[in-house]
């Protein structure tokens, strides 16, 4: 979280930014809020990228004001408008590319004053794993599956009975890249698993982390995915 | 869920003051504006002005300055109204409503002016 | 001060039957316009804010459109629920201005 403080003569207004990551291909959000104005007519959002000449975005006098967008993000950003009379100043960024990350100013000017934050936006890929039994396969198998991972990520396996076991002699991991020559699939397999147990497959690059888990008993099979962002920080 | 009380209805003199009161739960008390608006009967809804709870600063409708004073104890997670030299056209129900989109009312507090 | 002009002050319709009511700012407003309904013996209640933008739990019913100085609220089907008075409010600039008020009844 990172908060910060504008002067304007008397008055300074708190920005908040928290940091955060898009998914490339996917939409994203880069989160911003501030002391709200009571009036729409006198604030200005202004999101800055560092290294980049022209804005970002641009919404003052209750529109977008796009005539000094950079060429990189012309048509991809949108303020939530409906917010910004309520101090949300967050940009929604569509189609999130690799070149995206960096480090964004959220610069804010009400009737009470000015005020500015930074954020660091990193962008990657990351998806859910889905585990499952390979049926294929000579001795019971598990099979973790996740479509888009980027920078490449690590992969461990976990058991719930077995607790810090070493898995990596008995597992084998493989990256496949996809056809738009960034992302890769993951898949990693898990030789001579029991049953009644709970494996976990967990995937990890300096981005996101996910878990797969599968419990496998005589009578049933049963899944859990979890994914978490691992850089939301407020400033 | 975000609940506004205000206080009772109120009978007063010309020339005296009222002071309304606003109390609020459910949410985070001081991150936005509390307005206050006023419905004479029959009448269309007057914004009179609004207060920003954590700051305490204000903005007044013009009409009201130098007779309204909006205030704020945040301790009680309450905000207050205060109308002075009340004559007879400032009876009306007064409203309290929570930050600058009006997202929240509270019930509406009955002010009779009346010698 | 900006000034926010209704039309029609009231109205009569059918259930079913769909309902427009319009509001005019003096001057631009941007999309700086909510529309709230009020029910008698009741605090208004917020439906549309930013102009189109309807509020959490709003009926989707209820819809709002337009920009600079003209903007309209409409009720697809009109409900017997929906007898009530219909503001519109800027919120663009101060003070904070609302429209003389729609009453709706039912036919």
């Known amino acids: 979280l990172i908060i910060g403080f504008g002067i304007s003569g008397r008055h300074s207004i708190t920005v908040t930014t928290v940091a955060s990551a898009g998914n490339i291909g996917e939409d994203g959000i880069l989160s911003c809020t501030f002391e709200p104005d009571i009036k729409l007519s006198d604030i200005v959002i202004q999101w800055l990228k560092e290294g980049v000449l022209g804005l970002v975005h641009e919404f003052k006098e209750g529109k977008d004001e796009l005539s000094e967008q950079d060429e990189m993000f012309r048509g991809r950003t949108a303020v939530f408008a409906d917010q910004v009379i309520v101090g949300n100043a967050s940009l929604r960024l569509k189609n999130v590319q690799l070149t995206d990350a960096g480090t964004y100013k959220c610069y804010i000017i009400t009737s009470k004053g000015k005020g500015n934050a930074n954020l660091e936006y990193k962008t990657g890929a990351f998806s859910m794993p889905e585990v499952n039994v390979d049926y294929n396969a000579s001795s019971e198998t598990l099979r973790c599956e996740a479509p888009r991972w980027f920078p490449q990520p690590t992969v461990v396996w976990a058991s719930q009975v077995d607790q810090g076991a070493n898995f990596s002699e008995v597992s084998n991991t493989s990256f496949e890249l996809n056809s738009e020559n960034v992302t890769m699939k993951v898949v990693s397999v898990l030789y001579n698993v029991t049953i009644n147990n709970t494996y976990s497959c967990m995937i990890e690059n300096d981005i996101a982390k996910a878990t797969g888990d599968i419990k496998v008993t005589e009578s049933e099979i049963k899944r859990r995915s979890h994914l978490q962002l691992l850089n939301s920080k407020a400033s | 869920e975000v609940q506004l009380v205000q206080s009772g209805a109120e009978v007063k003199k010309p020339g005296a003051s009222v002071k309304v009161s606003c109390k609020a739960s459910g949410d985070t008390f001081t991150t936005y504006w509390m307005n206050w608006v006023r419905q004479a009967p029959g009448q269309r809804l007057e914004w009179m002005g609004g207060?920003?709870?954590?700051?305490?600063?204000?903005e007044y409708n013009e009409k009201f300055k130098g007779r309204v004073t909006l205030t704020v104890d945040t301790s009680a997670s309450t905000a207050y109204m205060e109308l002075s030299s009340l004559r007879s056209e400032d009876t009306a129900v007064y409203y309290c409503a929570r930050d600058s989109r009006f997202s929240y009312w509270g019930q509406g507090t009955l002010v009779t002016v009346s010698s | 001060d900006i000034q926010m002009t209704q039309s029609p002050s009231s109205l009569s319709a059918s259930v079913g039957d769909r309902v427009t009511i319009t509001c005019k700012a003096s001057?631009?407003?941007?999309?700086?316009v909510a529309w709230y309904q009020q029910k008698p013996g009741k605090a208004p209640k917020l439906l549309i804010s930013s102009a189109s933008y309807r509020y959490t739990g709003v009926p989707s019913r209820f819809s709002g459109s337009g920009s600079g100085t003209d903007f309209t609220f409409t009720i697809s089907s009109l409900q017997p629920e929906d007898i009530a008075t219909y503001y519109c409010q800027q919120h663009y600039n101060t003070p904070l201005t609302f429209g003389g008020g729609t009453k709706v009844e039912i036919k």
């Open positions: 207060i920003y709870l954590n700051r305490g600063s204000s």
């Open positions: 001057q631009d407003v941007s999309t700086a």
